[in-house]
């Protein structure tokens, strides 16, 4: 039975041209995390394999950085980066857990800076 839960940063906002950290945390399970995939709606952004490390998609190589931890840093944000992001935890023996984050990239300095994992 899958007992784990994923905590995420939830709905966050950031300014165009800035950076943001996407962060998820899997809790309430003893399952072993084998891999975390980060996806943006239709696209695979990055993979963090527990044994092998990180790979960033060639499509996002210049704007995505691994970490901190199992999180993902998005850089040089554009309004087109607005949308849903998913952290997909592959675990053994539980299976797959998915967390959702909604990022809104704002044109000016109206972005809220209260998000816990946001880069100033």
């Amino acid at each position: 039975m899958m007992t784990g839960t994923i905590e995420t940063t939830g709905n966050i906002s950031a300014e165009k041209g800035g950076s943001i950290i996407l962060q998820c945390h899997l809790s309430s399970t003893t399952a072993q995390v084998t891999q975390v995939n980060w996806e943006q709606q239709d696209q695979l952004l990055a993979i963090c394999n527990a044994d092998l490390g990180w790979h960033i998609s060639p499509s996002f190589k210049d704007r995505v950085a691994p970490g901190p931890g199992l999180g993902l840093t998005l850089q040089s944000l554009t309004v087109n980066d607005t949308g849903e992001y998913f952290c997909i935890y592959h675990t053994y023996p539980d299976g797959t857990y998915t967390g959702r984050i909604f990022l809104e990239v704002l044109e000016s300095s109206v972005a809220e800076h209260g998000a816990r994992f946001q880069i100033p």
Epitope: Q43, I47, L52, G53, H55, P58, K61, H90
Partner: antibody, heavy 119, light 107 residues
Framework: EVQLVESGGGLVQPGGSLRLSCATS????????MYWIRQAPGKGLEWVAY????????YYPDSVKGRFTISRDNAKNTLYLQMNSLRAEDTAVYYC????????????WGQGTLVTVSS | EIVMTQSPATLSVSPGERATLSCKAS??????VAWYQQKPGQAPRLLIY???ARHTGIPARFSGSGSGTEFTLTISSLQSEDFAVYYC?????????FGGGTKVEIK
């Protein structure tokens, strides 16, 4: 059993068009990113196109950009490659391939379909 | 474009011997390298990904190593079914590129 079966190849004149299909089975097609790869006779492998699992984004090398279009129909479990303005150098066996779900590599390939561009 | 250069072009080895295939990238690709095996008339088969991880079902005699710009595929004891062409591929950046291949033939 995972299967990918290409079709649509054949002989076409320079400047002509062709549409390749790749029928898939044995896996949930809509959960996977897909590729087209080609191999000219007696030569090495060349990446031709990449499409995200929902079909929202596509990527191509400069050699085919603007001439080739990759698309997919997730309801039909089928991948397509529309090839226009074909040139002699496009002559090759065209393979469709599935991206692994743990990396950006290709774990299952079809057997290929031969495209010959000649007058 | 990242150029992947494989050497040697042809490697003649006796069954049971060790084969070492080289692949060099024109710029740093980290560990974003895969190795494929192709036999005549067949599609390529994934052997190694992430430079050193064996794909499901690939025998332990196949091993990959390297990072940055230099990579190696080692077949510890060649079996008759291992005689084929081997390609390396980088997936660090677009365009995705393959090496020219190394043909492993029976000595």
């Amino acid at each position: 059993e995972v299967q990918l079966v290409e079709s649509g190849g054949g002989l076409v004149q320079p400047g002509g068009s062709l549409r390749l299909s790749c029928a898939t089975s044995g896996f949930t097609f809509s959960d996977y990113y897909m590729y087209w790869i080609r191999q000219a006779p007696g030569k090495g492998l060349e990446w031709v196109a990449y499409i995200t699992k929902g079909g929202g984004s596509t990527y191509y090398p400069d050699s085919v950009k603007g001439r080739f279009t990759i698309s997919r129909d997730n309801a039909k479990n089928t991948l397509y490659l529309q090839m226009n303005s074909l040139r002699a150098e496009d002559t090759a066996v065209y393979y469709c391939a599935r991206q692994t779900n743990y990396d950006f590599t290709m774990d299952y390939w079809g057997q290929g379909t031969l495209v010959t561009v000649s007058s | 474009e990242i150029v992947m250069t494989q050497s040697p072009a042809t490697l003649s080895v006796s069954p049971g011997e060790r084969a070492t295939l080289s692949c060099k990238a024109s710029q740093d690709v980290g560990t974003s390298v895969a190795w494929y095996q192709q036999k005549p008339g067949q599609a390529p088969r994934l052997l190694i990904y992430w430079a050193s991880a064996r794909h499901t079902g690939i025998p332990a005699r196949f091993s990959g190593s390297g990072s940055g710009t230099e990579f190696t595929l080692t077949i510890s004891s060649l079996q008759s079914e291992d005689f084929a062409v081997y390609y390396c591929q980088q997936y660090s950046s677009y365009p995705l590129t393959f090496g020219g291949g190394t043909k492993v033939e029976i000595k």
